[in-house]
Amino acid sequence: QPSVSPGEPSPPSIHPGKSDLIVRVGDEIRLLCTDPGFVKWTFEILDETNENKQNEWITEKAEATNTGKYTCTNKHGLSNSIYVFVRDPAKLFLPDRSLYGKEDNDTLVRCPLTDPEVTNYSLKGCQGKPLPKDLRFIPDPKAGIMIKSVKRAYHRLCLHCSVDQEGKSVLSEKFILKVRPAFKAVPVVSVSKASYLLREGEEFTVTCTIKDVSSSVYSTWKRENSQTKLQEKYNSWHHGDFNYERQATLTISSARVNDSGVFMCYANNTFGSANVTTTLEVVD
């Protein structure tokens, strides 16, 4: 429990006075917050938060999903917390299977435990397959398992959280990691033809091909020295993972002399931008 200097507001005090509490499923959770300026209890689990204005928090029959952090706050905005594990042998994990990782960043596999006293909390590949050799992770029973520095090669990796309970390995439900690639180069852009010579009234159509690692690449056709929004049509394909192609087709159904000029296909991603131009000359 917190120690205080006289005269200064102090954080609330919680009974039982420990940072973690383990209760069995079906048992009672009883938490008392003592503070003259008590405001509320906040209960934060994986999925949502709840509030309680009573200074005693009672859950008569604890369930695994009552596992989480209980925080008592006073009128000074000071708080104190206790983490409650509701031990349920039938429900060792509280999984959220939405799992996205940004390349080169860490990502959390959300499978917090309901029992911190199980052993060998780790990740395992599905169907007995080994995990990639370079996959590193850090387990945290209250949050889940953090995968360090996600690699592009981990895309669509199937894995389970795993613990040993009474000598047996217990697996969570399946998680499938979806990796969003980091842009490490500018998009590759090309144009179907570098210049066009047309008669008035003929159709002008030009296609720009944009290639990048994901559909997050931005592209547009622009007319040089003009802000006018050009009408374009898109087709796109994923040629396997991290090999995305878009075709942006610009069409002027009946070209006029004053449509002559330079048209630029511009593409950008978070790494940088690229462009390619085509010249249209319309004659009488």
Epitope: E48, T49, N50, R97, Y100, K102, C126, Q127, C158, I176
Partner: antibody, heavy 117, light 111 residues
Framework: QVQLQQPGAELVKPGASVKMSCKAS????????MHWVKQTPGQGLEWIGV????????SYNQKFKGKATLTADKSSSTAYMQINSLTSEDSAVYYC??????????WGQGTLVTVSA | NIVLTQSPASLAVSLGLRATISCRAS??????????MHWYQQKPGQPPKLLIY???NLESGVPARFSGSGSRTDFTLTIDPVEADDAATYYC?????????FGGGTKLEIK
């Protein structure tokens, strides 16, 4: 419980832009991805994009790239979507939806955007 | 883009009987046996409400009259028996691949 609050309606002029909000409560805002969905009688439900929890990265449906911009303010637990260069085709109901355990488990009530001169 | 085709576009079912709605994907939405297909119910003036997730899992609070089945490209939502309150439009949705897509919807009328 989990709530996503959206303003009921926005009336905007063609060519203008609109920024709509989605205020989240009842959960830890920074732990969940927020998606945006457009609904029109003609096109049905269309996924616009997602703002990812924590780092604020975004991913868009190419159809809405350059048209919609997704942002979030962690301090107020509010997600925003701005739509620019509005035309009559942008008149629709726009929903925010929280992704939980692979699915859209919670939806806002929707904002009706009407584009009219 | 993965295209989801729902059929029928509308159907009328008598109270107490079974309603079956189909959703066909233009390519598989499965990874390692997980089908990233979900079903929603929408009533006029309301947002969609999740009924079934990952093809066959009943969302908490949804009556057991609703069930989902299928894998890869072919999925089915079944309501048995149908009740008056089930009159609504039903949508399938995939989030296996960006961009996430929805089916065109099936309007259910109760006779």
């Amino acid at each position: 419980q989990v709530q996503l609050q959206q303003p009921g309606a926005e009336l905007v002029k063609p060519g203008a832009s609109v920024k709509m909000s989605c205020k989240a409560s009842g959960y830890t805002f920074t732990s969940y991805n927020m998606h945006w969905v457009k609904q029109t009688p003609g096109q049905g439900l269309e996924w616009i994009g997602v703002i990812y929890s924590g780092n604020g990265d975004t991913s868009y449906n190419q159809k809405f790239k350059g048209k919609a911009t997704l942002t979030a303010d962690k301090s107020s637990s509010t997600a925003y979507m701005q739509i620019n260069s509005l035309t009559s085709e942008d008149s629709a109901v726009y929903y925010c939806a929280r992704e939980r355990d692979t699915r859209f488990g919670n939806w806002g009530q929707g904002t009706l955007v009407t584009v009219s001169a | 883009n993965i295209v989801l085709t729902q059929s029928p576009a509308s159907l009328a079912v008598s109270l107490g009987l079974r309603a079956t709605i189909s959703c066909r994907a233009s390519e598989s939405v499965d990874i390692y046996g997980n089908s990233f297909m979900h079903w929603y119910q929408q009533k006029p003036g309301q947002p969609p409400k999740l009924l079934i997730y990952l093809a066959s899992n009943l969302e908490s609070g949804v009556p057991a009259r609703f069930s989902g089945s299928g894998s890869r490209t072919d999925f089915t939502l079944t309501i048995d028996p149908v009740e008056a309150d089930d009159a609504a439009t039903y949508y399938c949705q995939q989030n296996n691949e960006d961009p996430y897509t929805f089916g065109g919807g099936t309007k259910l009328e109760i006779k």
